[in-house]
C-alpha cells in the first residue's frame, strides 16, 4: 500500500502500512515523513540516505530495538526526530551523528535508563529534549549538557527520579541556561538536597504529582531554596494518586525562591484560607489557580501584589470578592458556582476575561462594575443573561469587547456603545439581539471588526445602522434571517474588506448596495436562496473584490434568468468553490453546475 | 460488527462496537460495573493513541430508546496544565490510566441507551477513535 501524499513532493504519511524497511519510492524532496507504527525494528547506518531534504521524521512505535552508528547521517536539515514508544535496546555512540540542525528530539517511552549514556552531547542546536516516560533514576545532568547551549525544554516527567542532589545540577552553574523549562512531574520524589537549586535560574519548573505526602512536599519545596524561576507550576493530576492532606505549611518553603509567575494546577482538596496558604506568593506578578475548589471567596480582597490573576475551571461557593489594587489582568474562565456577577474593585485593571462561566449580569456595564477606568479588553462571552443598563460610562478606553453566545437584553433601547470611541473589536454574535433601533452602533467611530452573526432584525430588514463605522474592515452578518437590506446600508463603509452575508434568506442579488465599498475584497453570499438578480441589469462589484462566494444558493437555470446567469459567468474569476454553485430549478437541471450550463434560449417564447 | 463486552451490573449490561474504520485496539474496564441507579468506581483504560492527546475532546451522541438527545461536547484536555496526566500523552505512547467516577440520584427509565463517543484530538483536529456504547438498562424491583 502506498504512502499518502499529504503535500505533493513534501509531506508523506506512511503510518501503519506494515513496512519492514524504509520506502524507496518517495521523492528526494520529501521534507516531512511519518513512518510511525511500522515494524522497522532496526536502523542501519545511512538509513535515510535517500531523504537529503528531510526536516521532520516521525518513527513512533516502529518496534525499533537497534540504532546503528550514523543511522541518521545525511539528514543535515532534520529539525525534529520523534522516537516515541520504541523499545530501544542498543543505541550506538554515533546513533545521532550528522544531525547538525536537530532542534527537537522526542525519545518518550524508549527504555532509556540514564541521561549519562544518551549520545546527544554533539547536538548543539537542540532546543527541546523530551525523555518522559522512561526509566531514568538519576537527575544528574551529564557534562555534555554544557554543549547544549540552545536547550529550552527538558521533559523528564514520568521517570523514576527519587532524589536530587547538589552535584546533579553542577553543569547548570557552569553555563546558566537562562531559558530552560524543566518538567519533573510524576517522578516519585522524596528528597531534594538543600542547596541543589541555589543560584540556578530556570524559565519554568513544573512539579505535579511528585510527592506522596504533605511532609515530603514540604521538605522538597524547602530543598528548592535559592532557585530563581520565572514560572513555577505545582499541583496534581485528577487521575493520579492525590495528597490526603494539604495545608499552609506545604508552601512555606516558597518564601526562599524568587518566583515571577505561579500556578497551582489541580488539587483534590478544598482551599479555605488562601491568605495564609499563599503567604509566600503575595508579590509574584502572575498568580494562577486551575481546577481547584475555593471555599472562602473573600480572601481575594487581601492586599496581594499580583498584576495578573487567573482562575480557570475552579469551583466557588459564590462569585469571589475581588479587591486588588495592582491587578492589571484578570482571567476568570470556565468556573463553576457563583452564577451572579458581583462588583469588583480593580482600579488598575486593563484586561478582563470573564468568559464561559454561565454568569448573569443584572446591569452592564460601567466603571462601577469593575472598579476601573483603565479597561481595554473585556470578554463576557459564553455567559448567561446580561442586561444592558448602562452604556460603558467610565470604560471609554475599551478596545476589545466580546459578548458572543451570551444572552443580551435591552440592546435596542438606547445607544449601548455610545461611549466606546476607542473600540476596535466587537463581537455580539449569537446573543439573541433583535435590532430594532438604528442607533445601536452609534459612537463606534474606531471600530474595525464587527461580528453579529446569529441575531435578528426587525422585519428581517437591514437598515442604515452602520453610518458611523467609517473604519470598519470586517463585518459578519451571517445567520441573521435577513431578507432585504437598505440600498444605502453600507454607504459609509469605504474601508470594509470582508463582508459575510451568508446563511440568510435573500432571494435575489443586487450589486447596488455595494457600490461605495471601495476596499471590499471578500463578499460571502453562500447559503442563501438566491435565484436571480434584483434588477435586470447588474452592475459590477467594486474593482477591489477578489472573492465572491455564491455557493449553495437556489439558482433558477431558466431562460428568463439568462442575463443573470451570464453575469455570473462573467464574474468567474471572482467566484470561489464554483463546483458548489448548482441549479435548483427547473427539476431537469437540478444539481447541474451553473457555470457549465449552456443556456441557449431559442426555445418557443 | 464485532461487539466487545465491558461488564454486567445489577441493572445494566454494557458493551461497545467501533464506529470508525481504523478500529485501533482499546481496552476498557469498569470496576465495579456501573449501576445506573447510583455508581462509584474506577474506569481503567489501556490505549496506544495514533496521535497526540493534546486538546482531546469527546463528541457524545446519546440515544434513549431511539430518541436522539442533542450532541454534547466534553472537553477533556484544554492544552496546557491539564487536569489529567494522559493529556500529555504523545502519539505512540502507552496510555495506561485509571479514572475514578461517581454519580447518584439519576433515575433512568428502562430500555436501550446508545452513546456514540467520538474522540477528537490534536491540531489540526482529527478523530482519534469512535466507539458506540450500548447500555441495556433493566431496573430491578428495589
Amino acid at each position: 500500500e502506498p504512502c499518502v501524499e499529504v503535500v505533493p513532493n513534501i509531506t508523506y504519511q506512511c503510518m501503519e502500512l506494515n513496512f519492514y524497511k524504509i520506502p524507496d519510492n518517495l521523492p528526494f524532496s520529501t521534507k516531512n515523513l511519518d513512518l510511525s507504527f511500522n515494524p522497522l525494528r532496526h536502523l542501519g547506518s545511512y538509513s535515510f540516505f535517500s531523504f537529503p531534504e528531510l526536516q521532520v521524521l516521525d518513527l513512533s512505535r516502529c518496534e525499533i530495538q537497534t540504532i546503528e552508528d550514523g543511522a541518521y547521517q545525511s539528514l543535515s536539515h532534520l529539525s525534529t526526530l520523534i522516537l516515541t514508544g520504541n523499545p530501544i535496546q542498543s543505541l550506538a555512540l554515533g546513533a545521532f551523528s550528522g544531525l547538525s540542525s536537530l532542534q527537537k528530539l522526542v525519545a518518550v517511552e524508549t527504555n532509556l535508563a540514564s541521561l549519562e549514556n544518551f549520545p546527544i552531547g554533539h547536538l548543539k542546536t537542540l532546543k527541546e529534549l523530551n525523555v518522559a516516560h522512561n526509566l531514568i533514576q538519576s537527575f544528574k545532568l551529564p557534562e555534555y549538557f554544557s554543549n547544549l547551549t540552545n536547550l529550552e525544554h527538558l521533559d523528564l516527567s514520568s521517570n523514576k527520579i527519587q532524589s536530587i542532589y547538589c552535584t546533579d545540577l553542577r553543569v547548570l552553574h557552569q553555563m546558566p541556561l537562562l531559558n530552560l523549562s524543566l518538567d519533573l512531574s510524576l517522578n516519585p520524589m522524596n528528597f531534594i538536597q538543600p542547596g541543589a537549586f541555589k543560584e540556578i535560574r530556570l524559565h519554568k519548573l513544573t512539579l505535579r504529582n511528585n510527592f506522596d505526602s504533605l511532609n515530603v512536599m514540604k521538605t522538597c519545596i524547602q530543598g528548592l531554596a535559592g532557585l530563581e524561576v520565572h514560572r513555577l507550576v505545582l499541583g496534581e493530576f485528577r487521575n493520579e494518586g492525590n495528597l490526603e492532606k494539604f495545608d499552609k505549611s506545604a508552601l512555606e518553603g516558597l518564601c526562599n525562591l524568587t518566583i515571577e509567575e505561579f500556578r497551582l494546577a489541580y488539587l483534590d482538596y478544598y482551599l479555605d484560607d488562601i491568605i495564609d496558604l499563599f503567604n509566600c506568593l503575595t508579590n509574584v506578578s502572575s498568580f494562577s489557580l486551575v481546577s481547584v475548589t475555593i471555599e472562602r471567596v473573600k480572601d481575594f480582597s487581601y492586599n496581594f501584589g499580583w498584576q495578573h490573576l487567573e482562575l480557570v475551571n475552579c469551583k466557588f461557593g459564590q462569585f469571589p470578592t475581588l479587591k486588588l489594587k495592582s491587578l492589571k489582568r484578570l482571567t476568570f474562565t470556565s468556573n463553576k458556582g457563583g452564577n451572579a456577577f458581583s462588583e469588583v474593585d480593580l482600579p488598575s485593571l486593563e484586561f478582563l476575561d470573564l468568559s464561559r462561566n454561565g454568569l448573569s449580569f443584572k446591569g452592564c456595564c460601567s466603571q462601577s462594575d469593575f472598579g476601573t477606568t483603565s479597561l481595554k479588553y473585556l470578554d463576557l462571552s459564553f455567559n448567561g443573561v446580561i442586561t444592558m443598563s448602562s452604556n460603558f460610562l467610565g470604560l471609554e478606553q475599551l478596545e476589545h469587547l466580546d459578548f458572543q453566545h451570551s444572552n443580551l437584553k435591552q440592546m435596542s433601547e438606547f445607544s449601548v456603545f455610545l461611549s466606546l470611541r476607542n473600540l476596535i473589536y466587537l463581537d455580539i454574535s449569537h446573543t439573541h439581539t433583535r435590532v430594532a433601533f438604528n442607533g445601536i452602533f452609534n459612537g463606534l467611530s474606531s471600530l474595525e471588526v464587527l461580528k453579529m452573526a446569529g441575531n435578528s432584525f426587525q422585519e428581517n430588514f437591514l437598515p442604515d445602522i452602520f453610518t458611523e463605522l467609517r473604519n470598519l474592515t470586517f463585518l459578519d452578518l451571517s445567520q441573521c434571517q435577513l431578507e432585504q437590506l437598505s440600498p444605502t446600508a453600507f454607504n459609509s463603509l469605504s474601508s470594509l474588506q470582508v463582508l459575510n452575508m451568508s446563511h440568510n434568506n435573500f432571494f435575489s442579488l443586487d450589486t447596488f448596495p455595494y457600490k461605495c465599498l471601495n476596499s471590499l475584497q471578500v463578499l460571502d453570499y453562500s447559503l442563501n436562496h438566491i435565484m436571480t438578480s434584483k434588477k435586470q441589469e447588474l452592475q459590477h462589484f467594486p474593482s477591489s473584490l477578489a472573492f465572491l462566494n455564491l455557493t449553495q444558493n437556489d439558482f433558477a437555470c431558466t431562460c428568463e434568468h439568462q442575463s443573470f446567469l451570464q453575469w455570473i459567468k462573467d464574474q468567474r474569476q471572482l467566484l470561489v468553490e464554483v463546483e458548489r454553485m448548482e441549479c435548483a430549478t427547473p427539476s431537469d437541471k437540478q444539481g447541474m453546475p451553473v457555470l457549465s450550463l449552456n443556456i441557449t434560449c431559442q426555445m418557443n417564447k | 460488527q464485532k461487539q466487545y463486552w465491558v461488564c454486567n451490573s445489577s441493572d445494566a449490561s454494557i458493551s461497545y462496537t467501533y464506529c470508525d474504520k481504523m478500529q485501533y485496539p482499546i481496552s476498557i474496564n469498569v470496576n465495579p460495573c456501573i449501576e445506573l441507579k447510583r455508581s462509584k468506581g474506577l474506569l481503567h483504560i489501556f490505549y496506544i493513541p495514533r496521535r497526540d492527546l493534546k486538546q482531546l475532546y469527546f463528541n457524545l451522541y446519546i440515544t434513549v430508546n431511539t430518541m436522539n438527545l442533542p450532541k454534547r461536547k466534553e472537553v477533556i484536555c484544554r492544552g496546557s496544565d491539564d487536569d489529567y496526566s494522559f493529556c500529555r500523552a504523545l502519539k505512540g505512547e502507552t496510555v495506561n490510566t485509571t479514572i475514578s467516577f461517581s454519580f447518584k440520584g439519576i433515575k433512568f427509565s428502562k430500555g436501550k441507551y446508545k452513546c456514540v463517543v467520538e474522540a477528537i484530538s490534536g491540531s489540526p483536529e482529527e478523530m482519534l477513535f469512535c466507539l458506540e456504547f450500548v447500555i441495556l438498562h433493566q431496573p430491578n424491583s428495589n
Epitope: D24, S45, Y46, S50, S74 | -
Partner: nanobody, 112 residues
Framework: EVQLVESGGGLVQAGESLRLSCVAS????????MGWWRQAPGKQGESVAI???????YYPDSVKGRFAISRDNAKNTVYLQMSSLKLEDTGVYYC??????RGQGTQVTVSS
C-alpha cells in the same frame, strides 16, 4: 557481510575530471539505494549523489551539472564521474548503501 571498496581518488588540478568506483561484495546492488557522501576537513558532511534502483538520481546544487552517478549491476559497481572539479570539492568520498553502511573512503584533492 557487506563490504564496499572505493577507488579512483587522487590529486587533480581545478577544472579537471575524476571517476570514482565502488565495488560491493556480500550484496547485490541492483535493488539498493546507492550513493556518494563526502567529508571535507572541518566541514559538514554532505551527500553528493544518490541513485535509486529505478534509476532516479539526486545531486545537491553544489555539484549539479558537474557530477554524474551510475551503476553497473553486472559488476556490482557504482561510479561517480566528476568533472570541472573545484577547490571546494576536496575531501574524502565515501560510497554508501542506504541502511547498510559505507566504505573506507577515497581521498580527492583539488589544487589550484
Amino acid at each position: 557481510e557487506v563490504q564496499l571498496v572505493e577507488s579512483g581518488g587522487g590529486l587533480v588540478q581545478a577544472g579537471e575530471s575524476l571517476r570514482l568506483s565502488c565495488v560491493a561484495s556480500g550484496i547485490s546492488i541492483s535493488t539498493e539505494i546507492m550513493g556518494w557522501w563526502r567529508q571535507a576537513p572541518g566541514k559538514q558532511g554532505e551527500s553528493v549523489a544518490i541513485l535509486k534502483s529505478d534509476g532516479t538520481t539526486y545531486y545537491p546544487d553544489s555539484v549539479k551539472g558537474r557530477f554524474a552517478i551510475s551503476r553497473d549491476n553486472a559488476k556490482n559497481t557504482v561510479y561517480l564521474q566528476m568533472s570541472s572539479l573545484k577547490l571546494e570539492d576536496t575531501g574524502v568520498y565515501y560510497c554508501i548503501i542506504a541502511g547498510r553502511g559505507r566504505g573506507q573512503g577515497t581521498q580527492v584533492t583539488v589544487s589550484s
